[in-house]
Interface confidence: low
């Protein structure tokens, strides 16, 4: 009932709560000299359910039969109606919808870890929209029998509170749990179990990894376990990985050998424990342990390759190059690279260690026969050394790749293709494609790219440190025994016209023609490969069409002459650049007067 | 040997900020885990916060729920702990650890203060109300 009620009475009967589709009836009745003043008779009950209107009857009461009320609590309230007053509230009744309790599903218990207390977990069901109140009983030996009332709205887990011992693992425990509402009540079926059953133990604990003699290959995980465990999982991976190694171990004792790891490698180890064969649950996987397996010794051999530049008629500049071993091959930190050159005929040999750099630089006589070695060394020893004899890689013309071409091949790759030399092309042991950014002046601090191609293959797709806009001066060796030949090409992966024309920086008159020089377009402004310069004049004050002469590009060149021009006839110069995409726009102009005679 | 000191501690206002400071002597931070706990009048001593200098990862206890951060300082060799909104119940008696940082460890070991191996004298934290 709500409020005081003092004018009269709302019943409900059969009663306040109340099986979804029954009917319900209703009284309002108001109390002795609580009507209208005047005219009793006129009294007006009006019953509302919430705010709306239902039923309404004059006189001392208000009977109201009501069907189809939906599930959850519905407020009915009576309202006293005289003449010329508002409408007076002489009472009310909420009247609850609901079911009766299903039975529970899927009751099952757990207690985790031998430390640990029984804990049940089930499923309600539908919801009853009443008050539910569930029991949850757990018989066992001697006779005895917990239990536990819940009282949450939405119950489905209890914690009984009580720690199962392992004493005698075969006795039986059933658990049952009762839902009880207003409607009716309902049971679970029975779950019965022993202590090995719903005991899940404890994730191990403690978790350490051991490497007998820093060596990979002895290796034991150690961890802790409760005392009643018999079987363990464990499962490994390399940190960077997604996939696991699954072992599966009994009687472990807290102690397992890994035959299988790889060197310098960070794993990560979860294990997980069972108290027995066939019954039970696993525990959860215990926390992490990442751990770093130690290094071994490099495996693999360094790919080399190298530079000769010619210094003067009796010395020569040598470049050394290698690529990083891989993390597989370098099975630890390569702490240096040891270079040996050595002059074969005369047995000198020089050795260095390169720390932090993956080049080297000597300079040599241009005489004898020399060759390299280049090893990689960890903390435990080093790869086996690559060794190269130093040659000239462009002497023999007719190991010269043919038609050679570089072609942009999507964003930042640049597929390069030749035809294999006149000469035998049999004897081809291997192709190289290198590049590298094409910098005016030919600078030797400029990376070096390369890969290396099988004698059968005559195409390659470059794309490590490939930029766009960017010329690349390409060559491709083919290699036989100890004799080379060359071509090389310019390519870009994307092309556009040059930002700028070259800078015209002096005209000078030499026997009745001038010579014209510039400065290069910056390469940041050249926008890819370069394929011609232009020279554009015309008489300073006509407004004819300029003449042009076009030159092909090259790298080293930055003067040109012009033999055309009349004498004491005074001109404008200027100069564009042209990629396969356009022309770039006008560089600087200059003007100038030839002094010399007229024909 | 590491010798650790504490320093910054104070008597506050609820609400206030404060920073402490841990200073190693004898020897760089630059292989250890450095973990803050905190000691309460009558309470064990509870874990706040940890550091691993080498890789530089931090480690909280989330019930102090972001209010208190981990930093270094590589030049000065110190770690500190900011602790912003401090409350009445952040009273206690600050301590810094030290371990030399070991090849593996377990997800919980920098929790531990039986994990640790050196320790400062401590410095005590006010917070009035």
């Known amino acids: 009932k709500i409020d005081a009620c003092k004018r009269g009475d709302v019943t409900v009967k059969p009663s306040h709560v109340i099986l979804l589709g029954s009917t319900v009836n209703i009284t309002c009745s108001l109390k002795p000299r609580q009507g209208c003043f005047h005219y009793s008779r006129r009294n007006k009950l009006i019953l509302y359910k919430f705010d709306r209107r239902i039923n309404f009857h004059h006189g001392h009461s208000l009977n109201s039969q009501v069907t189809g009320l939906p599930l959850g609590t519905t407020l009915f309230v009576c309202k006293l109606a005289c003449i010329n007053s508002d409408e007076i509230q002489i009472c009310g009744a909420e009247i609850f919808v609901g079911v009766a309790p299903e039975q529970p599903q899927n009751l099952s218990c757990i207690q985790k870890g031998e430390q640990g207390t029984v804990a049940c977990t089930w499923e309600r069901g539908r919801d009853t929209h009443l008050y539910t109140e569930y029991t949850l009983q757990l018989s066992g030996p001697k006779n005895l029998t917990w239990q536990k009332q819940c009282k949450d709205i939405y119950c489905d887990y209890l914690d009984f509170g009580i720690n199962l011992t392992p004493e005698s693992p075969e006795s039986n425990f059933t658990a049952k749990v009762t839902a009880v509402n207003s409607l009716g009540s309902s049971s679970s079926l029975p779950s019965t179990f022993t202590f090995l059953d719903i005991v899940r133990p404890l994730p191990p604990w403690d978790i350490r990894i051991k490497f007998q003699k820093a060596s990979v290959s002895r290796c034991t995980l150690y961890w802790r376990d409760e005392g009643l465990v018999l079987l363990n999982r464990l499962r490994y991976r390399p940190s960077n990985s997604r996939l696991w190694n699954m072992v599966n171990v009994t009687k472990a004792k807290g102690r397992h050998d890994l035959l299988d790891l790889k060197p310098f490698t960070e794993y990560e180890f979860q294990i997980s424990s069972k108290l027995h064969l066939y019954k039970g649950s696993w525990s959860d996987w215990s926390e992490s342990l990442r751990a770093q397996t130690p290094e071994e010794e490099p495996t693999g051999m360094l790919d080399v390759w190298y530079m000769k530049r010619h210094i003067d008629y009796s010395r020569q500049q040598i470049s050394l190059f290698w690529k990083n071993l891989s993390v597989s091959e370098a099975r630890g930190k390569i702490l240096h690279y040891q270079v040996t050159l050595q002059e074969l005929t005369g047995g000198k040999a020089m050795t260095q260690n390169i720390t932090g750099h993956t080049s080297w630089t000597t300079v040599i006589p241009r005489t004898g026969n020399w060759a390299v070695a280049v090893s990689a060394a960890n903390s435990k020893g080093s790869s086996l050394p690559t060794r190269i004899n130093i040659m000239n890689l462009c002497e023999a013309g007719l190991l010269a790749p043919r038609q050679v071409s570089a072609n942009s091949e999507g964003m930042d790759n640049i597929l390069v293709t030749w035809q294999p030399p006149r000469k035998d092309p049999s004897a081809v042991q291997e192709y190289v494609v290198e590049w590298r950014e094409l910098h005016p002046g030919g600078d030797t601090q400029v990376p070096l790219n390369w890969l290396r191609s099988r004698p059968y293959n005559v195409s390659a797709l470059i794309s490590e440190n490939i930029k766009s806009y960017i010329c690349y001066e390409i060559r491709v060796y083919a290699l036989s025994g100890d004799q080379g030949g060359c071509s090389s090409i310019l390519g870009n992966s994307k092309h556009k016209a040059p930002l700028s024309g070259p800078h015209i920086n002096a005209i000078t008159e030499e026997k009745g023609s001038i010579l014209i020089s510039w400065n290069s377009i910056p390469v940041q402004e050249q926008m890819g490969c370069l394929l011609h310069y232009r020279i554009y004049w015309k008489e300073r004050d006509s407004n004819s069409q300029p003449q042009l002469c076009e030159i092909p590009y090259r790298v080293s060149q930055n003067s040109h002459p012009i033999n055309s021009l009349q004498p004491r006839v005074t001109y404008v110069l200027w100069m564009t650049a042209l990629t396969a995409a356009g022309e770039s726009s006008h560089g600087n102009e200059r003007e100038f007067c030839l002094q010399g005679k007229a024909n | 040997q590491v010798q650790l000191q504490e320093s910054g501690g104070g008597l506050v206002q609820a609400g206030d900020s404060l920073r402490l400071s841990c200073a190693a002597s004898g020897r760089t931070f630059d292989t250890y885990i450095v973990g803050w706990f905190r000691q309460a009048p009558g309470k064990e001593r509870e874990f706040v916060s940890a550091?691993?200098?080498?890789?530089?990862?931090?480690i909280r206890d989330d019930s102090l729920r972001g209010r208190f951060t981990i930093s270094r300082d590589n030049a000065k060799n110190t770690v500190y702990l900011l602790m912003n909104s401090l409350k009445p119940e952040d009273t206690a008696v600050y301590y810094c650890a030290a371990k030399a940082k070991p090849p593996a460890a377990t997800w919980s070991s920098y929790r531990n203060r039986e994990w640790y191996d050196y320790w400062g004298q401590g410095t005590q934290v006010t917070v009035s109300s």
């Open positions: 550091l691993s200098w080498s890789d530089d990862t931090t």
